[in-house]
Interface confidence: low
């Protein structure tokens, strides 16, 4: 092969001598340098030589970054010239032109990772968050990766973003609570690492819920409180009905009986139970969120102002970890969540025309089960198109959570969502064109 300098003035002077030597070598040695005769139409070095059928000889190819400026003959090898700017040839070739450099097409979702050189075409890949949807030796068109729903993550392929996301469930002990093309499953929080205990196990879509360790509880207390939780609303209803009846029908005897009934304390309860030693009843099977705190699971949204009051300071001194509300989904409440509050003396006292209640009043302010939802109720999440592994049956949707009151101090239940932060954005699939 001859490079451009061979055709310059000094090169031409040496030309006849060089060609004469080539002729002698070709005649005397069958293993000579190109051009050389080939009867079987194959050349020794197929990468760097090619068969020229017109003359039945093997000639040199031009190296990468060059092209054929003059074809070979029986007495002269191929003459090569360097590719002009913005053109290239990648391989040993016998092309008479260089190929034009093409930019990466952003409309097609491609971005440049290496510029074009005389020896290599522009290197492109799919933009972050995209995958190669059209492939013809190289990627020509990228499309947006599809989201993986909560409880799943994109199975991470290697470097070539040649395929769309394949969403796989989070492995055991991990969760992912967003719809995203790149969010990765995160390990469940280990409550014990933070000096807390598990209140509700994590699922594939939500983190473990943590709470402060509770002191041992007298077994009979929870029974008493369960009675109270169920009977108090009933007692109120009866009280109101009776009062209404007293006013309406003027039955003084009935009013007197009611007064004497309300002066009694609930059976088996002493005057001063120890503050803080009481456990509220476990979730009722039909009203599972009656005693559960309304704490949202963390979502992949910014903690912008939601118009909610700030969480009150807990008496035990544990900072309340506030999670941003995910306004797109119903809060997922797990059965069995418990809370701990301080209490004074429990009892119902009616004196004269007024009624004093010391103790915990549970006010159920949710919609009537089975009834139409109110205008302020969040819609229940539609059933997702994939299975959700849950530790327990979720309660009926749409139930609000009551707060507990004791005198003038308001105490939020100390159940916490530990470490529940919006999941980190993981890698986005990327594609590199190899040539």
């Amino acid at each position: 092969m001859l490079l451009p300098w061979a055709t310059s003035a000094p090169g031409l002077a040496w030309g006849p001598l060089v060609l004469g030597l080539f002729g002698l070598l070709a005649a005397s040695q069958p293993q000579a340098v190109p051009p050389y005769a080939s009867e079987n139409q194959t050349c020794r070095d197929q990468e760097k030589e090619y068969y020229e059928p017109q003359h039945r000889i093997c000639c040199s190819r031009c190296p990468p970054g060059t092209y054929v400026s003059a074809k070979c003959s029986r007495i002269r090898d191929t003459v090569c010239a360097t590719c002009a700017e913005n053109s290239y040839n990648e391989h040993w070739n016998y092309l008479t032109i260089c190929q034009l450099c093409r930019p990466c097409d952003p409309v097609m979702g491609l971005e440049e990772i290496a510029p074009c050189t005389s020896k290599r075409k522009t290197q492109c890949r799919c933009q972050p968050g995209m995958f190669c949807a059209a492939w013809a030796l190289e990627c020509t068109h990228c499309e947006l990766l599809s989201d993986c729903p909560p409880g799943t993550e994109a199975e991470l392929k290697d470097e070539v973003g040649k395929g769309n996301n394949h969403c796989v469930p989070c492995k055991a002990g991990h969760f992912q609570n967003t719809s995203s093309p790149s969010a990765r499953c995160q390990p469940h929080t280990r409550c014990e690492n933070q000096g807390l205990v598990e209140a509700a196990p994590g699922t594939a879509q939500s983190d473990t819920t943590c709470k402060n360790p509770l002191e041992p509880l007298p077994p009979e207390m929870s029974g008493t409180m369960l009675m109270l939780a169920v009977l108090l609303p009933l007692a109120f209803f009866l009280l109101l009905a009776t009062v209404f009846s007293c006013i309406w029908k003027s039955h003084p005897s009935l009013c007197r009986k009611l007064g004497s009934l309300l002066k009694r304390r609930p059976q088996g309860e002493g005057p001063n139970p120890v503050a803080g030693s009481w456990e509220p009843p476990k979730a009722h099977p039909y009203f599972p969120d009656l005693v559960q705190p309304l704490l949202p699971i963390s979502g992949d949204v910014s903690p912008v102002s939601t118009g909610l009051p700030a969480a009150p300071v807990l008496e035990a001194g544990v900072p309340q970890q506030q999670s941003p509300l995910d306004l797109t989904r119903e809060p997922q409440l797990e059965p069995g969540e418990q809370s701990q509050v301080a209490h004074g003396t429990n009892g119902i006292h009616v004196t004269g025309g007024s009624m004093t209640i010391t103790g915990n009043i549970y006010i159920y302010n949710g919609p009537v089960l089975g009834g139409p939802p109110g205008p302020g109720d969040l819609p229940a999440t539609p059933e997702p198109p994939y299975p959700i592994p849950e530790e327990g049956d979720p309660g009926p949707p749409g139930l609000s959570t009551p707060h507990q009151e004791d005198g003038k101090a308001w105490h939020l239940a100390e159940t916490e969502h530990c470490g529940a932060t919006p999941s980190n954005r993981g890698p986005r699939n990327q594609f590199i064109t190899h040539d």
């Epitope: 290697d158 470097e159 993981g426 890698p427 986005r428 590199i432």
Partner: antibody, heavy 113, light 107 residues
Amino acid sequence: EVQLLESGGGLVQPGGSLRLSCAASGFTVSSYVMKWFRQAPGKGLEWVSSISGSGGRPFYADSVKGRFTISRDNSKNALYLQMNSLRAEDTAVYYCANDMDVWGQGTTVTVSS
Amino acid sequence: DIQMTQSPSSLSASVGDRVTITCRASQDISSFLKWYQQKPGKAPTLLIYAASALQSGVPSRFSGSGSGTDFTLTISSLQPEDFATYYCQQYNTYPLTFGGGTKVDIK
């Protein structure tokens, strides 16, 4: 020219630690999936770990999970492999590579008492 | 994990021979397969990616074919510099896995 150069190999006792470095030139490590491979003496190639271009979740072979940590320093344009609790079977030549399939020349790690 | 089975584990051939190496995946990997060449004391070099695409600068005597689970690397006319060990590698999913290698030596 795109190049990778590993360093940090050597002789270490079982249970010991080593930190391998991979210095990149001609490209930025933050733009590519970066990988570590290894090859035990007389054996085949084995993938060890990868880290994505956006610096997201790393991936590890089961044989090194919990012991090895892949990381990178974009300011130094370098990739690292922190190897703890080393075992005899970790003895190998360790190569770093990028997703354009540029490989380093390798660095030898020998775990022996 | 996806297992990659390469055969033969070694072969002897002469310059100019046509050489074929096969690689089988334990499950469908589409076309996410690479072929590497490694010479003693050197790092591997990529020959083929995406099962059949020739890496830039690699001689055209190397070619790859196959899709799904069965793949082939062919050297159309073996050259002296081709005596080396060849590995296939799947990159369909993590963990990335290699075949056991095929050593090509001089007959």
